[in-house]
């Protein structure tokens, strides 16, 4: 530990990583050596940075000063930080940004200036010397109102650019066009007024575009003022966006301009509508282009129970391969929609309200003909037998996740789609496993249940996940002749022997930590002498603790030594 000049303490490790966040520092500590590589002073009370404060820290690679109250940084404060790669000045009181701060930072890869009360990004191009910059975050929620053409000059490639333009009033055309390539652009905008102007400048340079916190209720698409159809955008995310039936139709028109769009995502959005997506101008049906993946999470639809016929969406879905609709209060997927999803290979309906009887309507005859993976985790399924029977229509289904549904009981026999290879029944409160489990399985996850016995013959099973149950022994290897992976941690297993392990002829990975091991002399000698064991036991030695004898309880099996007298009683 090194004491700073103003009596608050910093802790530095031998690698030069210094942490001093959430203290009462009111200036940058002066008593540190020049070996310091990382300095985290976030959430303190530093208001002023002088030219000399950081002068000696020539090896500094990361400087985090977020949430301090900094209102002044002297011109040459960062002049000695030629090795600095990470600078976080977010959520301070910097109302004027100076290019002289950043000029010396030739190694800078990450710069965060979010949440400071500046109106613009300064008088001159701030970032033109930062040739190695890869992640840039700028803007604020209220005072940042103007984006200028020179703001991003000199930046050619960014992995991530986040702009909080929540209250943007003015956008100078081509301001964002100067950056040739941005992997991921996050744009916060409350209003959509300038959206199309900005969008025009992004189509040929941004790969993933994320729009946040925007009210699109009154959005209307008008033809883009660009001849370019050569769009680089592959993924478009709407996060915390408000939308209506009509404006969703307008958004779809906008998206149809993006020729290479593959993925659409809606997170935490609100749809104020009843599912009438026709569009008031009776436009042609929108071509969904190449979109293959649609992800919807936590969609809020106030008028969900007044939803109309979704048939206007059906033609848009035929080429989609992957759909996720998670935590959005879905209780029924219309049969007709399921039938239109001809190319769908992956469907995730986690954390919804599906019951078997309504799932039957969704998985009707000819529904989801290409479906291979179905995830129904944490829905309202209650009968394993009914669930399997309901899904018999899905001829190509190989992977099924029905974890976190409450089944309790497993019938003696069940019917399943015949190609089933993967079944997840974890956290379903089942007490026993029966012949209901399909023999075709290669992977079975039944972790976190109430099982005290596993005696199923699964001739093709390669991976068994059975942690967090009440098993007292390893399963019988002869019942699982192809097993490669066995994860059986956090059960009540007291011991296992070399003979038991050897009987799993194909086993490559065993995870058996967190059990109640009786550290007998036999168990200790077997585990401590087998060097090869460490290769198989992936969680060895940390998770293997003795439960008894009492005097070694809590100690690692690897470390315990019993006396000669204890072993020769």
């Amino acid at each position: 530990k090194e004491e700073s000049s103003n009596q608050a303490s910093l802790s530095c490790d031998h690698n030069g990583i210094c942490k001093g966040s959430s203290g009462s520092l009111n200036s940058i500590p002066s008593g540190l050596t020049e070996a310091v590589k990382s300095l985290d002073l976030s959430n303190n009370r530093i208001t002023y940075i002088s030219n000399s404060d950081l002068q000696r820290y020539v090896n500094l690679q990361a400087l985090v000063l977020t949430s301090n109250g900094i209102n002044t940084i002297e011109e040459d404060s960062f002049s000695s930080l030629g090795r600095l790669e990470h600078l976080d000045l977010s959520y301070n009181y910097l109302s004027n940004l100076s290019s002289s701060w950043f000029k010396p930072l030739s190694s800078l890869k990450f710069l965060n200036l979010l949440g400071n009360p500046y109106k613009t990004l300064g008088e001159t191009s701030l970032f033109s010397h930062l040739t190695k910059l890869r992640i840039l975050r700028v803007g604020n929620m209220d005072t940042f109102t103007k984006i200028q053409r020179k703001d991003f000059a000199g930046l050619t490639f960014l992995e991530e650019l986040e702009i909080d333009a929540s209250d943007l009033q003015s956008y100078e055309p081509k301001s964002l066009k100067s950056i040739q390539n941005v992997s991921h652009l996050i744009l916060h905008m409350k209003q959509h007024i300038l959206l199309l102007e900005i969008f025009v400048d992004l189509t040929s340079s941004v790969e993933c575009l994320e729009l946040r916190d925007t009210d699109l209720d009154t959005f209307h698409f008008s033809e883009l003022s660009t001849g370019e159809t050569n769009s680089l955008i592959k993924k478009f995310t709407f996060r915390n966006v408000k939308i209506t039936d009509e404006s969703l139709f307008q958004v779809m028109k906008l998206l149809s301009q993006i020729s290479g769009l593959l993925e659409l995502e809606f997170d935490d959005c609100t749809l104020n509508g009843v599912g009438d997506f026709r569009g008031s101008d009776n436009d042609r049906v929108i071509d969904p282009g190449k979109v293959e993946t649609v992800t919807i999470r936590r969609l809020h639809i106030p008028q969900f129970y007044s939803f109309n016929d979704l048939s206007t969406l059906y033609p848009l879905t035929e080429r989609v391969k992957r759909i996720t609709v998670e935590n959005s209060k879905v209780f029924l997927v219309p049969c007709l929609l399921s039938r239109h999803l001809k190319s769908l290979e992956y469907l995730d309906l986690s954390e919804n309200l599906m019951v078997e009887e309504y799932l039957k309507n969704s998985a009707c005859e000819d529904a989801w003909p290409s479906l291979q993976t179905l995830i129904l985790r944490q829905n309202h399924l209650a009968s394993l037998g009914k669930t399997g029977e309901t899904l018999l229509t899905l001829k190509n289904l190989t992977n099924l996740d029905i974890s976190k549904n409450t089944f309790h009981y497993m019938p003696e026999t069940c019917q399943w789609p015949e190609k089933m290879k993967y079944l997840n029944l974890s956290s379903t409160r089942i007490h026993s496993v029966t012949g209901c489990i399909p023999k075709t399985l290669e992977i079975l996850d039944i972790s976190n249940n109430n099982l005290n016995l596993f005696s199923l013959n699964l001739p093709q099973l390669k991976e068994l996940y059975i942690s967090r149950n009440k098993l007292m022994t390893l399963p019988d290897a002869s019942l699982l002749p192809m097993l490669l992976v066995l994860k059986i941690s956090r059960n009540t297993i007291t011991t296992f022997s070399k003979e038991q392990l050897d009987s799993f002829h194909t086993l490559k990975t065993l995870e058996a930590g967190g059990n109640n091991f009786i550290c007998s002399c036999e168990f200790l000698s077997f585990t401590q002498e087998q060097q090869a064991l460490a290769k198989v036991l992936v969680d060895w030695p940390a998770n293997y603790l003795c439960d008894s004898p009492s005097h070694v309880r809590g100690q690692r099996v690897q470390d315990v030594r019993l006396s000669v007298s204890e072993c020769h009683r």
Epitope: R298, H300, Q303, Y305, S306, F307, L310, N327, K329, V330, F331, L332, P334, C335, L336, L337, E351, L353, M354, V355, E357, Y358, N361, Q378, H380, K404, T406
Partner: antibody, heavy 118, light 111 residues
Amino acid sequence: QVQLQQSGPELVNPGASVKLSCKASGFTFTTYGINWVKQGPGQGLEWIGWIYPRDGSTNFNENFKDKAALTVDTSSSTAYMELHSLTSEDSAVYFCARLTGGTFLDYWGQGTTLTVSS
Amino acid sequence: DIVLTQSPASLAVSLGQRATISCRASESVEYYGTSLMQWYQQKPGQPPKLLIFGASNVESGVPVRFSGSGSGTDFSLNIHPVEEDDIVMYFCQQSRKLPWTFGGGTKLEIK
């Protein structure tokens, strides 16, 4: 097994407020909606509204929008309904019920009798 | 609001015979091929108990003598053969549109 245990009978003065509770057990509280239903003396059933414990979202019958407030405490798996500005019209048995499949009420509490009288 | 009209308000039946209770909705309660209509039984001093959901799906643990049918606006609950334990109140309920509404109830009586 699934259970919804409601708080005991209440006798309150007109104009006052009352908070009824519904403690859930035997299922994952945050996975299901909790509905509230009113049954006046010798009368039919009237849907008040629901709350989803996972995100706290609510939906109300317009007739009860200014009368009832729904909340949950996920740490104790308990749902609450507070009724305001009580009148004799509010005297009734109030049931909480678990909403399954987004559409049906498969488990009900035993009911709380509310009597509003001076 | 969708109004549910149950008929008759009371029905006298002989034990062992069939009882049919009707419920008519003021507009369709169809939702993409599923009728969002439920039936509940209520005994005196007890909460309602779910019998049928989605118009025809019998809730787990409910005796097979109970069945539901219908679509669109017209639904019925059938009990056959009627047992003494069934001589109580029955309510229909729709969850197609908010606010969810219940029928006025039908009281089963012994003839």
